[in-house]
């Protein structure tokens, strides 16, 4: 039994890091493998993660962690029984994938303005809380070409757009994702999408 693709890990910079790797053949990850991880500090102990299958030869492990700080560094040991298959390290602050925003809501009752709001996925005491920016994706269910991205570079988790920038009388969907420039993170996953029917009053033509 050998590791084909070494573990790569990302942290949500809160409580979970996710490590994925591939074995050289079909593997029952949860029964055959264990990933041990240990914070490199005095009096820290190793914790065990039981991996799950992620495709035939793929494994994934969700590591429970303390609130992350930039100094944190973990040793990682991948074991198959008594055999050490791989040894490495992981610094969560250098491999951050933020949590996805939640509670995306489209408010359509504001005089021909669409107000999209969502929730910041972090509590106020987390460092990322005040460092997230967002991308909002809006698309038409009827027209695949009607697909747009709005970059929200301010901290407030909301976006206002004129309803007239979208077609009237058809259904749209929206979703939002986050990233943090300070840690050069990857983008989060997209939030669940929300749907609304876009309708607005056409302005009277002036003659």
């Amino acid at each position: 039994m050998k590791v084909l693709q070494e573990p790569t890990c990302v942290s949500d910079y809160m409580s979970i890091s996710t490590c994925e790797w591939k074995m050289n053949g079909p593997t029952n990850c949860s029964t055959e493998l264990r990933l041990l991880y240990q914070l490199v500090f005095l009096l820290s102990e190793a914790h065990t993660c039981i991996p799950e299958n992620n495709g035939g030869a793929g494994c994934v492990c969700h590591l429970l962690m303390d609130d992350v700080v930039s100094a944190d560094n973990y040793t990682l040991d991948l074991w198959a029984g008594q055999q050490l298959l791989w040894k490495g390290s992981f610094k969560p602050s250098e491999h951050v994938k933020p949590r996805a925003p939640g509670n995306l809501t489209v408010h359509t009752n504001v005089s021909d303005t669409l107000l999209l709001t969502w929730s910041n996925p972090y509590p106020p005491d987390n460092y990322l809380y005040n460092h997230l920016t967002y991308a909002v994706n809006i698309w038409s269910e009827n027209d695949p070409a009607d697909f747009r991205i709005y970059n929200v570079t301010y901290l407030e988790p909301s976006l206002r757009i004129a309803a007239s920038t979208l077609k009237s009388g058809i259904s749209y969907r929206a979703r939002v994702r986050a990233w943090a420039q300070c840690y050069n993170t990857t983008w989060s996953e997209w939030s669940p999408s929300t749907k609304w029917h876009n309708s607005y009053r056409e302005p009277f033509e002036q003659h």
Epitope: F41, L42, L43, E45, H47, D66, V69, A71, D72
Partner: antibody, heavy 117, light 112 residues
Framework: EVQLVESGGGLVQPGGSLRLSCAAS????????MSWVRQAPGKGLEWVSA????????YYADSFKGRFTISRDNSKNTLYLQLNSLRAEDTAVYYC??????????WGQGTLVTVSS | DIVMTQSPLSLPVTPGEPASISCKSS???????????LDWYLQKPGQSPQLLIY???NRASGVPDRFSGSGSGTDFTLKISRVEAEDVGIYYC?????????FGGGTKVEIK
């Protein structure tokens, strides 16, 4: 919210014994090393002992080895310190603390141990 | 054991003025990853100690930004940019490089 509540302190005669407890809540107790620190009246802080999250590793300052014993019951979220062969100079407030990144991130309110005849 | 030495023993301060406390260790607290294994704690009158600064220079959650830690190796400093009345108490440094964990003797900060 992390909470640590010590108990078990009191008046004991020289040569006597006492068991201190520290009830923990607000965090996954078994994942953290824990420690005892004491403070004699009007004096500074003195580290006594620590124990790993699983209870398998214990550490003591030299002056307490053989007399004090640290232990934990993860099923009860409780840390203990057994004090034996107590002397007058062991009179102090004993604090339990949660260890993280080598440091003492959260402290209890302390329990007073008085050794006197 | 690593010996921690703090100075001054007592520090009378004026509210609004800066204050500085020194801590020296008998051996270097700088480890391989580039972090200094030194914490600062404050014990307010009648209270338990609380963590202020960890790893030499990182403020613990909820600690006001008027507190800062600096230094490396064997020489460390805790600075309060503008002292407030609520900052009175005894300040301790502690090394977290090895067991036994050892504290400095403490610096008592009081209002003039």
């Amino acid at each position: 919210e992390v909470q640590l509540v010590e108990s078990g302190g009191g008046l004991v005669q020289p040569g006597g014994s006492l068991r201190l407890s520290c009830a923990a809540s607000g965090f996954t107790f078994s994942r953290y090393a824990m420690s005892w620190v004491r403070q004699a009246p009007g004096k500074g802080l003195e580290w006594v002992s620590a124990i790993g999250g699983s209870g398998g590793s214990t550490y003591y300052a030299d002056s307490f080895k053989g007399r004090f014993t640290i232990s934990r019951d993860n099923s009860k979220n409780t840390l203990y310190l057994q004090l034996n062969s107590l002397r007058a100079e062991d009179t102090a407030v004993y604090y339990c603390a949660r260890l993280l990144r080598g440091g003492l991130w959260d402290w209890g309110q302390g329990t007073l141990v008085t050794v006197s005849s | 054991d690593i010996v921690m030495t703090q100075s001054p023993l007592s520090l009378p301060v004026t509210p609004g003025e800066p204050a500085s406390i020194s801590c020296k260790s008998s051996q270097s607290l700088l480890e391989g990853q580039g972090y200094n294994r030194l914490d600062w704690y404050l014990q307010k009158p009648g209270q338990s100690p609380q963590l202020l600064i960890y790893l030499g220079s990182n403020r613990a959650s909820g600690v006001p930004d008027r507190f800062s830690g600096s230094g490396s190796g064997t020489d460390f400093t805790l600075k309060i940019s503008r002292v407030e009345a609520e900052d009175v108490g005894i300040y301790y440094c502690m090394q977290t490089l090895q067991t036994p964990l050892t504290f400095g003797g403490g610096t008592k900060v009081e209002i003039k």
